[in-house]
Interface confidence: medium
């Protein structure tokens, strides 16, 4: 396994007062094995609201690498392959749960954290505000 | 506290052999406060690849209820508001971490699980296979 310099202030696993703490088995079970692993990997190029993927890395977090989508254009790609600014490319965002080492560098102590990630983009009709 | 019929096979928190077990503080920290999480709540109706949300419930999982996106059409909505079958609505999928009570009914013992959820839909150009 990985060797993490242990923080001397790491909480004691046996401490019954360690706040809201539960035992979690990190042998992660993946329920997705029966799904067709046809990842939506090429959708980012084929979409009418294409996106680029940016790597976000944090060694104190699990998962340590998260790929974030950034829409390539403000508008959407039309049938001619041009950007149509009458439509909008918008990120589809999702909150995900991650584990953060807390205190930092403690190998067996984590806190659940909610972070907002952009998963991909979709093309939407804009909301037009009419000025009276 | 809560009355849960306790499973006699619940693991002992002090058991050093309990596989890959860590202490997790479940006071979920929200990293999203500095952003204005403009919830993408209306995109599912405004998208050219609109989607419906379907309820998936599992009482032994947290969160117990997950609403999954299902694309409304095979094709995409064109400028006239009709479905264009020359384009495809496809789901954007993302793996998320959930907690599962394991063994079931043990109040303080969980397993991390990865599940694949459909977050929304995007409109893509189809892959056309030409028959020789």
């Amino acid at each position: 396994g990985i060797t993490i310099p242990r923080n001397p202030g790491c909480p004691n696993s046996e401490d019954k007062n360690f706040p809201r703490t539960v035992m979690v088995n990190l042998n992660i079970h993946n329920r997705n094995t029966n799904t067709n692993p046809k990842r939506s990997s090429d959708y980012y190029n084929r979409s009418t609201s294409p996106w680029n993927l940016h790597r976000n890395e944090d060694p104190e977090r699990y998962p340590s690498v998260i790929w974030e989508a950034k829409c390539r254009h403000l508008g959407c790609i039309n049938a001619d392959g041009n950007v149509d600014y009458h439509m909008n490319s918008v990120p589809i965002q999702q909150e995900i749960l991650v584990l953060r080492r807390e205190p930092p560098h403690c190998p067996n102590s984590f806190r659940l954290e909610k972070i907002l990630v952009s998963v991909g983009c979709t093309c939407v009709t804009p909301i037009v505000h009419h000025v009276a | 506290g809560i009355t849960i019929p306790r499973n006699p096979g619940c693991p002992n928190s002090e058991d050093k052999n309990f596989p890959r077990t860590v202490m997790v503080n479940l006071n979920i920290h929200n990293r999203n406060t500095n952003t204005n999480p403009k919830r993408s709540s209306d995109y599912y109706n405004r998208s050219t690849s609109p989607w419906n949300l379907h309820r998936n419930e599992d009482p032994e999982r947290y969160p117990s209820v997950i609403w999954e996106a299902k694309c409304r059409h095979l094709g995409c909505i064109n400028a006239d508001g009709n479905v264009d079958y020359h384009m495809n609505s496809v789901p954007i999928q993302q793996e998320i971490l959930v907690l599962r009570r394991e063994p079931p009914h043990c109040p303080n013992s969980f397993r991390l699980e990865k599940i694949l959820v459909s977050v929304g839909c995007t409109c893509v150009t189809p892959i056309v296979h030409h028959v020789a």
Epitope: L97 | G1, I4, P37, S64, V65
Partner: antibody, heavy 126, light 107 residues
Framework: EVQLVQSGAEVKKPGESLKISCKAS????????ISWVRQAPGQGLEWMGG????????DYAQKFQGRVTITADESTTTAYMELSGLTSDDTAVYYC???????????????????WGQGTTVTVSS | EIVLTQSPDFQSVTPKEKVTITCRAS??????LHWYQQKPDQSPKLLIK???HSISGVPSRFSGSGSGTDFTLTINGLEAEDAGTYYC?????????FGPGTKVDIK
Amino acid sequence: EVQLVQSGAEVKKPGESLKISCKASGGSFKGYGISWVRQAPGQGLEWMGGITPFFGWTDYAQKFQGRVTITADESTTTAYMELSGLTSDDTAVYYCARDPNEFWNGYYDTHHFDYWGQGTTVTVSS
Amino acid sequence: EIVLTQSPDFQSVTPKEKVTITCRASQNIGSELHWYQQKPDQSPKLLIKYASHSISGVPSRFSGSGSGTDFTLTINGLEAEDAGTYYCHQTFSLPYTFGPGTKVDIK
């Protein structure tokens, strides 16, 4: 459709204890949270505390700490709120309310009350 | 604890008029603010969650906006059935707190 049905009105004497029930039907009781909110006559809403059955967590407002106990029984899908050392200031309508704890449209849809019980009127008088 | 202040305390409004209720938090609460309506002798009812997200079954004339410390509930075209007290509610940190309420009545 989620429904929360509370126990009936109570009349208590100062110093006594009170235990109100909130029976839930519909939805995953284990997965959602139940909070208790009270409203004194002519006053606003006051959060007392809540429970998340999935984790067995309870949270209490400091004001009620030591005097309130919130419990839940998964087998009967019922939450309870017990308040001890009653005084006339505890005369109020007590509501249970559901915190959905759902993952909806990409977000953890939690920490608000989408369904409420009908309220239990409690009068504390000597 | 986070203190929520609402203004106005009371508003008397003619039907079809626009009503604006503001809620200010004593610290940044992101968008963890919700709005409830309570009619006399009834339980509160959720109107808006997360500052601006509409609730299924709630008329579209109700809308919410804001983030951080300043929030607004707007009723576009008040109807007679909208009479009642409106509360804002923060769930950013424990203890959860409610605003003191804004009573709306129909002229």
